[in-house]
């Protein structure tokens, strides 16, 4: 028998520095977690103690903090090289800055293979990008070889900016011939490493003949056997065992997100490459694990540029950006409109001639807007200003909801109106009218939504049975502020870009902004 240790991360989202327990900015260092310096300590400890170790990343290193905003992926290549990752799969967020923003900072600089078998280049891009990422790689480990085959969510064109010259094929269809090719190379230990979410990971384990282990990402799935060490609730045991169509037991793993845990899986193979046993658990990277001094020193060196960036002007406002709780928790506020407009703008993807865009709606809890921005400071808006408005380090995500769920969400928005509570919704691509004289749960008297399947966008009444795409904060997607119906009834959820980054990019693009209060939210006469 031959034993392999798989160390894995996924959805790190530019958490290069240690973070608080909820993966936001570290405040009290003695209680902080994760970060590449701490990760390196643990990885090195395991490499020294065990003979056959692979360090893998399942995608979405890009996007999530000011590190990515400033360094645009160069930080990912640099620190992943320093940690000596063995392979990485491309995630959807690796395309956030377009193909060029993937090629130059990461693909050309990474000293480890970057993989995806289901992304095929065409047209002029094919010649430019070919060979920079691979469908698979064979890695010598001790006296054996291990094949790693990569995959990426086929939803990427709707979630990021890969352009029109990359085709995202069905994962299973694309993986099988590459696994077959590995088999002809006499590689009998094969790991599928990819970024399509836990459901697809399980399907790959079931359907792709020859895959021995699946290491996934995208869905931020936390798996754990025994008592979990922090706040995350396990979605199943680690590893999650899937019985393949040809009768094999295939371990599937994922390691939550944000570099908070290091996935740790031990696999025992027989001489023919069959998995005999698999066990392990994610390792919580808490403050009991010291940060590696040399990596930490490097982080501090790279940090300097971030501090300079946060005070630079992104753009100007010529109007007061009202982000006060007195406004945003009671009525339409122009800060809410600005943020929602930025959220929609960030999700413009013309992937189908029938649609002007795939999504037109935004909802945003008023309680998530934490500060106004005064225009009387020469109109200057900085990252620092935006960090005061959106201090929680969240993301603006894409969900699919039925009209009936949206209706419930808007009823919840005003179910206890008047108490300055955070659930009052700011909107984009939605016209809502409330009648507060009616009883809670029956206060939405009009709810019109902007069409997507149209050449001239216009507002139509919400249809209860129709499925709509909506951009919203991850906080709401996870049921925050009492929006349990969103969490329970959402049909699909894809993580999006860092909230501040979305707004800062929009402001930089627009240069001068002047958001108005324009009647998106109304109260019917006599009730307000």
């Amino acid at each position: 028998a031959w034993e392999l240790t798989i160390l894995h991360t996924n959805d790190v989202h530019s958490r290069l520095e240690q973070t608080s327990e909820d993966s936001s900015k570290c405040v009290n260092a003695s209680r902080c977690m994760g970060g590449v310096a701490r990760l390196f300590t643990k990885v090195q400890q395991i490499r020294r103690a065990e003979p056959n170790v692979l360090l893998l990343d399942a995608g979405d290193q890009y996007q999530g903090t000011i590190w990515f905003t400033v360094y645009k992926g160069a930080e990912v290549a640099h620190f992943m090289n320093a940690l000596r990752y063995d392979a990485m799969a491309l995630g959807n967020h690796e395309f956030d800055n377009g193909v060029e923003g993937l090629i130059e900072p990461l693909l050309k600089e990474a000293k480890f293979p970057i993989l995806s078998a289901n992304i095929k280049a065409k047209g002029p891009l094919a010649s430019q990008i070919s060979g920079l990422y691979l469908p698979y790689k064979v890695l010598p480990v001790g006296d054996e070889v291990v094949g790693i085959v990569g995959y990426t969510s086929k939803e990427t064109p709707f979630l990021s900016n890969p352009g029109t010259n990359l085709v995202f094929e069905d994962e299973i269809t694309a993986l099988q011939p590459e696994v077959d090719k590995l088999k002809t190379l006499n590689v009998n230990k094969i790991i599928a490493l990819g970024h399509s979410g836990f459901e697809m990971d399980k399907l790959i384990a079931q359907k792709v003949r020859g895959v021995d282990v699946v290491v996934g990402g995208h869905s931020n799935t936390f798996l754990y056997t025994g008592n979990p060490p922090s706040k995350e609730v396990p979605a199943g045991k680690y590893p999650f065992i899937v019985t393949s169509d040809d009768g094999r037991k295939v371990p599937v793993v994922q390691a939550y997100a944000f570099g908070k845990y290091l996935g740790y899986l031990k696999i025992e193979f027989d001489e023919r490459g069959n998995v005999i046993s698999s066990h392990g658990n994610p390792i919580l990277l808490n403050s009991s694990i010291p940060e590696d001094p040399s990596i930490k020193a490097d982080i501090n060196k790279w940090r300097i540029k971030l501090d300079n960036y946060s005070t630079q002007e992104l753009g100007k406002t010529i109007v007061y950006l009202d982000g006060s709780s007195q406004s945003c928790r009671f009525r339409e506020c122009n800060m809410g409109n600005l943020i929602c407009d930025a959220m929609i703008n960030n999700n413009l993807r013309h992937t189908d001639e029938m649609f002007w865009n795939h999504v037109s709606m935004c909802i945003l809890n008023g309680g998530g807007i934490r500060s106004p921005i005064d225009e009387r400071n020469n109109g200057t808006i900085t990252w620092e200003n935006l960090a005061a408005v959106l201090p929680f380090g969240g993301t603006f995500d894409l969900v699919q909801l039925k009209g009936s769920t949206l209706k419930k969400a808007f009823e919840h928005s005003v179910h206890r109106y008047g108490q300055s509570t955070g659930e009052f919704l700011q909107v984009g691509g939605i016209h809502v009218v409330y009648d507060l004289s009616r009883k809670p749960g029956d206060r939405v008297v009009k709810l019109d939504v902007l069409c997507t399947k149209c050449r001239v966008p216009s507002y139509d009444p919400l249809k209860m049975d129709e499925v709509y795409k909506v951009i919203l904060p991850n906080f709401l997607a996870n049921g925050g502020d009492g929006f349990q119906m969103i969490k329970d009834e959402l049909l699909r959820h894809d993580s999006g870009d860092q909230d501040i980054n979305v707004v800062s990019t929009y402001i930089s693009k627009m240069k001068v902004i002047y958001p108005a209060v324009e009647g998106r939210i109304k109260f019917s006469t006599g009730s307000h």
Partner: antibody, heavy 117, light 107 residues
């Protein structure tokens, strides 16, 4: 440092058999395929076949089946190719070259075989 | 089997020139294209694998590109030591096949 050291020049008569060797160092012999390539004087390169020393699996170019036989001795980290029933057409330089996944990345210096009566 | 064609069998260039050598496959080889260099003494070295990946130790003046059936090798700033014959080779389908080679000479 990866090295593939091939045996020396061979002179043979038509109908003879020859066996050449490729001694390797600097890597784990059993985890890489060993490929063999033929080059006739002033000509291009022709793939003969390959052996996987880890389990002695072989794969051949149809054209060389019956002509070439590939073997490996893992204890000596050495691959062998035997050519039988030699003719003038077999006069060539023969290279051994290893492969892990995408490409034949390190080559031996070549063994020259001359078939003459 | 897949035929690999290097239309230019010999090429003459000056030191410092940018030189491009092309190679065509008889069918789509899905980027499984490698370039090998054979020096006049017979020594063979891998330069580029999977269309554009530089093999370790190969100078960055060598680059590769292409897709589908058409591929090319570029030497951006020709040096004396680059005088050699260059072979393309497909690794998509057995049997592996080579182009006829392009012999590079100095003007």
């Amino acid at each position: 440092e990866v090295q593939l050291q091939q045996s020396g020049t061979v002179l043979a008569r038509p109908g003879d058999s020859v066996k050449m060797s490729c001694k390797t160092s600097g890597y784990t012999f059993t985890t890489y395929w060993m490929h063999w390539v033929k080059q006739r004087p002033g000509q291009g390169l022709e793939w003969i076949g390959a052996i996987y020393p880890g389990n002695s699996d072989t794969t051949y170019n149809q054209k060389f089946k019956g002509k070439a036989k590939l073997t490996a001795v893992t204890s000596a980290s050495t691959a062998y190719m035997k050519l039988s029933s030699l003719t003038n057409e077999d006069s060539a330089v023969y290279y051994c070259t290893r492969l892990l996944d995408y490409a034949m990345d390190y080559w031996g210096q070549g063994t020259s075989v001359t078939v003459s009566s | 089997e897949i035929q690999m064609t290097q239309t230019t069998s010999s090429l003459s260039a000056s030191l410092g020139d940018r030189v491009t050598i092309s190679c065509r496959a008889s069918q789509d080889i899905r980027n499984y294209l490698n370039w090998h260099q054979q020096k006049p003494d017979g020594t063979v070295k891998l330069l580029i694998w999977y269309t554009s990946r530089l093999h370790s130790g190969v100078p960055s003046r060598f680059s590769g590109s292409g897709s589908g059936t058409d591929y090319s090798l570029t030497i951006s700033n020709l040096e004396q030591e680059d005088i050699a014959t260059y072979f393309c080779q497909q690794g998509n389908t057995l049997p592996w096949t080579f182009g006829g080679g392009t012999k590079l000479e100095i003007k």
